[in-house]
Structure formats: C-alpha cells, structure tokens
C-alpha cells in the first residue's frame, strides 16, 4: 500500500532505535571514509526530520523518496570531492541514477586500518558511559568495512555485543569473559558478511531469477514438508528482502524481513515443525534464528524423483507449458530430498536437467534422450564429495594453520600474479573451512564446505575485479556463480607465469616479529611462503616444508635469544642462503 510519507511509515514500523541504527549503517556503507561523528550528526538530522513527518505527513519534503532524502544528505557533506574523488560526481545525477552511482562506488576493500578491539577495561568504561554511542561506533566501524553487510543482521550482532558487554563488564575478570565471547561474535559476523556479499553478487550479476533459484533450493532443504507454493512465496519474499538490502534500501529491507519472520511464525503449520523456538524470541533474535533454523524432518514417503521428471510421458509438455515453474518444481523436489547437498551442487544439477530438456525435447524421441539424465548427475555429485573428503582428510592431518599453508601453496601456484596479501587472506579464509565444517556429521559436511568456499571465492573475484592480473582467476570469475568453485578447484599450475626474482629483503625479518600476536606471526610466515612459491612455482611440497621448518626454527631460536637483534641480523642472511639452496 502507498503511504503519504515513506520516511514516517518506516520510522513508525521500525521504531526509533532500529531506524537510527539502519540509517547509520546506510550512511557508513555509502561513505566509508567519514568519521563516526560526521555520520552520527546526519543520522540525528534524518531522525529529527522523520519525527516531523510522523507528526504531520503533509509537512514539507515528507513525501520525498528515501533515496532522495538520504542522497541529498550525503551530497550536502562538505569536502565531498576532496575526500571521495569521483564519487562526488554521483551528486550531479537525479534519482534513481544517483543511488545506482553510490552503489557502484562501494569499496569491498577500503583502505581503513584494521578494526582493533579496545582493551577490556577501556571498552567497559566507554560502554558504561554511553552504551548508545558505543554501539553506534560498532555499527559504523563494521558497516564501513563491509559495505554489503546484511543490515538487519548487523543490528542483531550489535545486540549480541551489547548483551556480552552488559554481562562481562560486571565481572571481576572482564578480559577472560569478553575475549572468547566477542571472538565468537566476530567470527560469525565475518562469515555472515561474505555470505551476504555472495548473495548481492548473485543479484547484481545474474538478477533476481538467479537469487530466487538459490532461495528455492535452500528453503526446500530446510523446509521439506512445505509445499512448492509455500516455498515459492518464501523465496519471493526473501528475494525482495535481499534485493532491498543489496540495493541500499535498508529501512525497507529490515521492515520486510520483520514481515517475513511474522508470516513464517503465523504459518508454522504449513512451513516447518521446527520454528516455534525461534518464534518465541524478540524480533532480531527471531529473524536470525529463522535464518539458520535446523532442517525439518523429511517426509518418510516421498516418491522417487524419476516419476515426475523422467518417467512421466508428458515431461516435455509440462516443461513447455511453464518452463520456470517446472524447473522450480524440479529444484524443489530434488532439494527437499537432499539436505546433504550444497545449494551450489543442487543448482548445477537443475542447470544440467534444464540443458538436457532443452536438447531432448527438440528431438524425435525425447524420453529415450532424457531417460538417463539422473545417471548423468553422478559425476557432478561425486566431484564435490571427493573435494570434501580430500580436504577434510588433509585438515585432520595438518590442523588449521598447516591446512591454510597447503591451500596457500595450491592457490599461489594457480594464480601467482595475484597480490600476496590477497592470496594470504584468501588462503586463511579458505583454510578455516576445515575448523568450520570438517568436524560436522558426514551429511552436513558437503553443504557446509562448498557453500562456504563459494562465498570466499566470491570475495577473491571481487578483489581481483578491481585489478585483474590473472587470466586463470578472470576465467573462473567470469562464469556462473555455481561453477566458480569447481573451476578454481580444477585450476593447475599457471604455466604462463614467469617466476619472480629472488629478493633477499622479502625474506629478511627483524626482532619486532617476536612480540606480534600469534595471528600476525602466522600472516608474516604465510606471506613468506607465498613469496617462495612465486619465486619457485614448481617447488615440491617437501622442498617448501624444509624451508618453512627452517624458517620456524630460525624464528624460535632468535626470539628466545638474549640479543634478538644480533641473532636476526647474523642468522637471517644464513637462512636466506639455505632457502635459496633448498629450492635450487
């Protein structure tokens, strides 16, 4: 229904707290370099204006669209051109082009300092002094580093943060209470960020139809007792919510997400028997809980998929009369029977089925042609199953750090032209799949591994798009989203690469490495490992292991030495010589 004032409507629906949080996230995601204070000032102005519209919907400018209102605010920021360069050109455009322009200037890898968590006492003091400002800073800092973070979900993480601080700041040992809990929230939030970025990529590159297919598969796995009409409704609504968030329409997105959660809780009987626990929670927790609710028990008496989609004499007729619905029904039926498959795999199978029907329904004897289609799925299913087994075996053997290093070597060989920081970030993220997924029960491993890898590789593609350097990466990133992971897995050593010259300074270290936190130490060592591979792309695993063991031993010895600086300056060159010899 149309409202006289969109801003008043959203303010009333969302309430002041969520309204302000979402406006802050929106501004922080669009203008990523502005300080918290600059954005907080704008948020307050927008909120005050929204309140005047609530009081009188006919007041001046209350009938303007949210894009117009927010865009005008952003464009009024002083020194926009000096700080943001060509983004300022967006302000010469009219809506909707202006908003599209802002979206195109979102930076997936902004040059901002890492988000450092303050020391526990300082954090608790700030939080107690002004919890609202403290949480505002959290929203601002996360949103500007993750310009596509799912806004209503970021409000949920802020709420989690708030609860943890409230609890831990009352304890004697604040540090040991806060650290594990906040680390847990950070890990979950980072995964949420890459997953949402993947959804926005799907929407941006392939449109709503592609996202809706993803949603149908995912929802059918989770709610196998819902019928196709119910799944279609949920997928359509979920597509709208994600389209809005990916498009920067955060107030509409959060409002529609709340509506969807309400619908699901009012229609549990037709959706799933597992929703009640989620539905008893308050809004942000409810929506979060529903998004990761456990799979409902599969109906016991599902007929074989072949009956409707292979053996039926009218397959081609049914396909011709409503292609999207027929393929949607196939995807729904296949997905509800396979919670053990990844969404990416299910979409590849649906694509294969569609291609088979396109080909076979044009032939003289279609049933003879498409009769073997389910058997042809086998290699598509085996490939990711083997990937999971091989990688989980390797993870169990090496542990997370060793597994990351194995991936780093593999990916540096596949795409040695990619910058070392990007390769290290990607390998560290890809390597976490072991900890995240390999410990799960067998039937949950494949969906966990492949869908997580796909999201991480999407980030690799986004970073590579900014400065394309590898033909291998360009090839895999240009295809469809569901084919990316198999494409990257199939890449071998890039034979076109001319090895990097050996530079001693790349492998020269100083005593400051000794005081770094473990994570930073690992990154330094992994940076060296990537550089070694770039120098010798065809080095064997044994050669690389010898060098890395020697390197670890060198660090251990020098960091324990009484005179660390002398140790590093004398033993460092010896290490470099031994490395060169080992790789010769």
């Amino acid at each position: 229904e149309a409202h006289k004032s969109e801003i008043a409507h959203r303010y009333n629906d969302l309430g002041e707290q969520h309204f302000k949080g979402l406006v802050l996230i929106a501004f922080s995601q669009y203008l990523q370099k502005c300080s918290y204070d600059e954005h907080a000032k704008l948020v307050q102005e927008v909120t005050d204006f929204a309140k005047t519209c609530v009081a009188d919907e006919s007041a001046a400018n209350c009938d303007k669209s949210l894009h117009t209102l927010f865009g005008d605010k952003l464009c009024a920021i002083p020194n926009l051109r000096e700080n943001y360069g060509e983004l300022a050109d967006c302000c010469t455009k009219q809506e909707p082009e202006r908003n599209e322009c802002f979206l195109q200037h979102k930076d997936d890898n902004p040059s901002l300092p890492p988000f450092e968590r303050p020391e526990a006492e300082a954090m608790c003091t700030s939080f107690k002094e002004n919890p609202t400002t403290f949480m505002g800073h959290y929203l601002h800092e996360v949103a500007r580093r993750h310009p596509y973070f799912y806004a209503p979900e970021l409000l949920y993480y802020a709420e989690q943060y708030n609860e943890i601080l409230t609890q831990c700041c009352a304890e004697a040992d604040k540090e040991s209470c806060l650290t594990p809990k906040l680390d847990g929230v950070k890990e979950k939030a980072l995964v949420s960020s890459v997953r949402q970025r993947m959804k926005c990529s799907s929407m941006q590159k392939f449109g709503e139809r592609a996202f809706k297919a993803w949603a149908v598969a995912r929802l059918s796995q989770t709610f196998p007792n819902a019928d196709f009409a119910e799944i279609t409704k949920l997928a359509t609504d979920l597509t709208k919510v994600n389209k809005e968030c990916c498009h920067g329409d955060l107030l509409e997105c959060a409002d529609d997400r709340a509506e969807l959660a309400k619908y699901m809780c009012e229609n549990q009987a037709t959706i799933s028997s597992k929703l009640q626990t989620c539905c008893d929670k308050p809004l942000l927790k409810k929506a979060h809980c529903l998004s990761e609710v456990e799979h409902d028990t599969m109906p016991a008496d599902l007929p074989a998929i072949a009956a409707d989609f292979v053996e039926d004499q009218e397959v081609c007729k049914n396909y011709a009369e409503a292609k999207d619905v027929f393929l949607g029904t196939f995807l729904y039926e296949y997905s509800r029977r396979h919670p053990d498959y990844s969404v990416s795999l299910l979409l590849r199978l649906a694509k294969k089925y569609e291609a088979t029907l396109e080909k076979c329904c044009a032939e003289a004897n279609p049933p003879a042609c498409y009769g073997t289609v389910l058997a042809e799925f086998q290699p598509l299913v085996e490939e990711p199953k083997n990937l999971v087994k091989t990688n989980c075996d390797l993870y169990e053997k090496l542990g997370e750090y060793g597994f990351q290093n194995a991936i780093l070597v593999r990916y540096t060989q596949k795409a040695p032209q990619v910058s070392t920081p990007t390769l290290v970030e990607a390998a560290r993220n890809l390597g976490r799949v072991g900890t995240k997924c390999c410990t799960l029960p067998e039937d949950q491993r494949l969906p966990c591994v492949e869908d997580y890898l796909s999201a991480i590789l999407n980030r690799v593609c986004l970073l590579h798009e900014k400065t394309p350097v590898s033909e291998h990466v360009t090839k895999c990133c240009s295809g469809s989203l569901v084919e990316r992971r198999p494409c990257f897995s199939a890449l071998t050593v890039d034979e076109t690469y001319v090895p990097k010259e050996f530079k001693a300074e790349t492998f020269t270290f100083h005593s400051d490495i000794c005081t770094l936190p473990e994570k930073e130490k690992q990154i330094k060592k992994q940076t060296a490992l990537a550089e070694l591979v770039k120098h010798k792309p065809k080095a064997t695993a044994e050669q690389l292991k010898t060098v890395m063991d020697d390197f670890a031993q060198f660090l251990d010895t020098c960091c324990k030495a009484a005179d660390k600086d002398t140790c590093f300056s004398t033993e460092g060159p010896n290490l470099v010589t031994r490395c060169k010899d080992a790789l010769a």
Partner: nanobody
Framework: EVQLLESGGGLVQPGGSLRLSCTAS????????MGWVRQAPGKGLEWVSW????????YYADSVKGRFTISRDNSKNTLYLQMNSLRAEDTAVYYC???????????WGQGTLVTVSS
C-alpha cells in the same frame, strides 16, 4: 492454455448440502496447490479453502471450518468442495483457483453461483 471449469452450484435451503467440482486442463494439475475462492454480492474475494498438490494438507477459512471439506483427485485433474450445513452468508459465486504461490492465485475459473435461501 489453462482452463478451470466449475460445476455443482445452485439454490439450496439453509442447512442443506452441495458438492462443487472443478475440472482442470492446460497445466500439470498434480504440481499445484488448488483452492476455492468466493465473492459474495457486493464484497471482495476471499479464500475459502486450499489443498496441497499431494492432498496432505488443507486450509479452511474460519467461517467454513467444520462444514466444508476440500479434496482432489489428481488422476482425474479434478478439485472438489463438499459444503454441508450451508448458511445464508455462504451465498456467493465460488471460483476454483490455481495457486502458484502461497497466498496468491494466478488463474481462476468462470465461477459457479451458490444461493442459500429459504
């Protein structure tokens, strides 16, 4: 093309019964949720009842619960509505509807008039 043909309407006394039928063609009947929608004189459309593709779940509006029964025969591409204990307020044109998405219908028939009057 999609066709839905209702039959079985008519004039009936309060407390009486009727059975509506709907024969479907032009689409894969067994893949779709089907339902009955009605429009009383001077009123809007309202969902009366719907049934899942496999017949395992049925929905009824509160106003007809316990009196109406929806069923389907996928082998005959036919939808039914058994209406018992009819009341004057059940007077309406009853439409058979095909639902592609929960809460919406994309096709419905010409309708059959049910008049409950003494």
């Amino acid at each position: 093309e999609v066709q839905l043909l209702e039959s079985g309407g008519g004039l009936v006394q309060p407390g009486g019964s009727l059975r509506l039928s709907c024969t479907a063609s032009g689409f894969t009947f067994r893949h779709y949720r089907m339902g009955w929608v009605r429009q009383a004189p001077g009123k809007g459309l309202e969902w009366v009842s719907w049934i899942r593709p496999d017949g395992t779940f049925t929905y009824y509006a509160d106003s007809v619960k316990g009196r109406f029964t929806i069923s389907r025969d996928n082998s005959k591409n036919t939808l039914y509505l058994q209406m018992n204990s009819l009341r004057a307020e059940d007077t309406a044109v009853y439409y058979c509807a095909k639902s592609y998405m929960a809460g919406t219908f994309d096709y419905w028939g010409q309708g059959t008039l049910v008049t409950v009057s003494s």
